[in-house]
């Protein structure tokens, strides 16, 4: 599923991401935009043999199990395919674990490069939340 901007903002808010670990909802929507272009089925392969999955491009080396990433830690204890569902529950729950890990949203390269220090509230402006 490819979410609309406000549709995703509403879904993320429903799942408790607004101000989760101090990160406003705009940060999460911005991260999803630049990680996956709001596409729940996005997959991207990395040079280390791992793959990133879903709307927040969660990595199989650390967070989920795709059955083929050497040394996978699977810290969210889920199959990576669960992160590709049109229901974003699994992605949100895993993202909460990631953002609590010490580096905050710096774990997402796209957030660091494209969202951090910008007017992220623009990503939820005009949305009825």
């Amino acid at each position: 599923k490819v979410f609309g901007r406000c549709e995703l903002a509403a879904a993320m808010k429903r799942h408790g991401l607004d101000n989760y670990r101090g990160y406003s909802l705009g940060n999460w929507v911005c991260a999803a935009k630049f990680e996956s272009n709001f596409n729940t089925q996005a997959t991207n392969r990395n040079t280390d043999g791992s793959t990133d999955y879903g709307i927040l491009q969660i990595n199989s080396r650390w967070w989920c199990n795709d059955g083929r990433t050497p040394g996978s830690r699977n810290l969210c204890n889920i199959p990576c395919s669960a992160l590709l569902s049109s229901d974003i529950t699994a992605s949100v729950n895993c993202a909460k674990k990631i953002v609590s890990d010490g580096n905050g949203m710096n774990a997402w390269v796209a957030w660091r490069n494209r969202c951090k220090g910008t007017d992220v509230q623009a990503w939820i402006r005009g949305c009825r939340l």
Partner: antibody
Framework: QVQLQESGAEVMKPGASVKISCKAT????????IEWVKQRPGHGLEWIGE????????YYNEKFKGKATFTADTSSNTAYMQLSSLTSEDSAVYYC?????????WGQGTTLTVSS | DIELTQSPATLSVTPGDSVSLSCRAS??????LHWYQQKPHESPRLLIK???QRASGIPSRFSGSGSGTDFTLSINSVETEDFGMYFC?????????FGGGTKLEIK
Amino acid sequence: QVQLQESGAEVMKPGASVKISCKATGYTFTTYWIEWVKQRPGHGLEWIGEILPGSGSTYYNEKFKGKATFTADTSSNTAYMQLSSLTSEDSAVYYCARGDGNYCYWGQGTTLTVSS
Amino acid sequence: DIELTQSPATLSVTPGDSVSLSCRASQSISNNLHWYQQKPHESPRLLIKYASQRASGIPSRFSGSGSGTDFTLSINSVETEDFGMYFCQQSNSWPRTFGGGTKLEIK
């Protein structure tokens, strides 16, 4: 136990298309990538590409882009590979395998012969 | 693409001999190297995964070693059922690639 059952041998004319199937049993089909591999005598094994049935995500070896197309039907736990514009170079045995990085589980292979 | 070069192309041995098959990668692939055995008209069978881990049900006479670019499959005291083709495969990057194979034949 995990099993991959491929469709039977095919004899096709040049220029035609063929669709090979791979039915998976014994595991959660949507969770693992399915890989496709080509084997021709004297050419060894070649990786064609892969599909993640749960999402339909696909990756292709550059060499097979435009030649192979992958699809999957999660209701029947079956992956498909369509090969188009067939030539004699496509005559080979085609295998599906479960994509565990290494391939512990293979189909029995589908022999494709392209001949006028 | 990562190229895998296997040597020798053919190995003629007597049952009871011990043999080593080589697989060399064109660049470092850590331990992401797997070995397969294939008999005529059969699918490949996984022997060794991640350079040195024996796959389920594989006899202890098969062992693997190596890391980086140089890998070895060793068969301690070859048995008649071991004859066939042996392939290596890398899963370090895409596209996945296979070696050209080593044929193990009876002398």
